[in-house]
């Protein structure tokens, strides 16, 4: 079927890096600079992404893929192909529309971006608290208590309830 | 909340230099690009280019050799001179922000109409 | 330069109907796109920012979709204050590029 294929279209044959240029009797052309082509037997190639303004280069365009971006400092890359960026916090915080808010009591977040997530509850595992949680840390469960000391038993209380946080547009 | 307030010359002849001026007022000037679009019956939207606070300038080409933008970043400015206007320059000129998000624009200035005519 | 091309350039529709409006791409963007609408008179106001994204203060009604070269934006349910020009925006290449705008008006 391929051999059938590049019979009948010739632009079959053109690998990525290049294009199937009409105007030249069907041959294969290379991509002019700051274009590429990422599939064999295209007809265009597809000029390359800039990163400008809010972004920055992650990866050079060449003849065969497309540039990449990420975002300046101080920011990081969201929606498809990094199409848009977002504010970093500091650990402990979480993005809200009226910036950067510290994690309420019994919540953490250990990253510069996502929301502040419940320390886990221990006693739904039958384990007790061995390292109290922060603003940036989860809580340490450890043994259950009846691993410790036969009879005795310790409740973790319930993380508390919150409102999903928001991420400011 | 930003505002961008902008002023500047409505009225040229044909040769002339159009100069506009844009205030930032709330929001921090010095972390955002800042940009320049016209507005024409014929031509819809068009980007004119772009600033940051470090002077960092992106023109577009098809008006990059008549056009010059720049920052007075002591006073929360920016400004557009094109020269040697001709009726076609005639629109509606926008200065707005680029968004900390992506290079879309959040904020519009309230814009001015320049009209070139002998 | 990319050329953003939105058509129909007048669109009629019923108050509380659904309004659809295309914006087609000469090439592959990704996501990189944005949606303004703007009223008699005032400056474009940025609806949605990365395809998808509704940017501050954006009623829920408004939604954007698509990657790549084929882009919507839509409106669930029209209001009387929806009528207005809606315009694309790509910003995966400089020079940014604008479409010629889809007017809105009420059927």
């Known amino acids: 079927f391929e051999r059938t294929r590049s019979l009948q279209d010739p632009c079959s044959n053109c690998p990525a890096g290049t294009f199937c240029d009409n105007n030249r009797n069907q041959i294969c052309s290379p991509c002019p600079p700051n274009s590429f082509s990422s599939a064999g037997g295209q007809r265009t190639c597809d000029i390359c992404r800039q990163c400008k303004g809010v972004f920055r280069t992650r990866k050079e365009c060449s003849s065969t893929s497309n540039a990449e971006c990420d975002c300046t400092p101080g920011f990081h890359c969201l929606g498809a192909g990094c199409s848009m960026c977002e504010q970093d916090c500091k650990q402990g915080q979480e993005l809200t529309k009226k910036g950067c808010k510290d994690c309420c009591f019994g919540t953490f977040n250990d990253q510069k971006r996502g929301i502040c997530r419940p320390w886990t509850n221990c006693s739904l595992d039958g384990k007790s608290v061995l390292v109290n949680g922060t603003k940036e840390r989860d809580v340490v469960c450890g043994p259950s208590p009846a691993d410790l000391s036969p009879g005795a038993s310790s409740v973790t209380p319930p993380a508390p309830a919150r409102e999903p946080g928001h991420s400011p547009q | 909340q930003v505002q961008l307030q902008q002023w500047g010359a409505g009225l040229l002849k044909p040769s002339e230099t159009l100069s506009l001026t844009c205030g930032v007022y709330?929001?921090?000037?010095?972390?955002?690009?800042w940009s320049w679009i016209r507005q024409s019956p014929g031509k819809g939207l068009e980007w004119i280019g772009e600033?940051?606070?470090?002077?960092?300038?992106e023109y577009n080409p098809s008006l990059k050799s008549r056009l010059t933008i720049s920052i007075d970043t002591s006073k929360n400015q920016f400004s557009l001179k094109l020269t040697s206007v001709t009726a076609a320059d005639t629109a509606v000129y926008y200065c707005?922000?680029?968004?900390?998000?992506?290079?879309?624009?959040?904020?519009w200035g309230q814009g001015v109409l320049v009209t070139v005519s002998s | 330069k990319i050329v953003m091309t939105q058509s129909p350039a007048t669109l009629s529709v019923s108050p509380g109907e659904r309004a659809t409006l295309p914006c087609r791409v000469s090439?592959?963007?990704?996501?990189?796109l944005a949606w303004y609408q703007q009223k008699p008179g005032q400056a474009p106001r940025l609806l949605i920012y990365?395809?998808?994204t509704r940017a501050t203060g954006v009623p829920a009604r408004f939604s954007g979709s698509g990657s790549g070269s084929e882009f919507t934006l839509t409106i669930s349910s029209l209001q009387s204050e929806d009528l207005a020009l809606y315009y694309c925006?790509?910003?995966?290449?400089?020079?940014?590029?604008f479409g010629g705008g889809t007017k809105v008006e009420i059927k």
């Open positions: 707005a922000r680029m968004g900390y998000h992506s290079p879309s624009f959040d904020f």
């Open positions: 709330g929001g921090s000037f010095s972390t955002n690009y």
């Open positions: 600033i940051n606070h470090s002077g960092n300038t």
């Open positions: 090439q592959g963007i990704g996501s990189n």
């Open positions: 990365g395809a998808s």
């Open positions: 925006q790509q910003y995966n290449n400089w020079p940014l590029t």
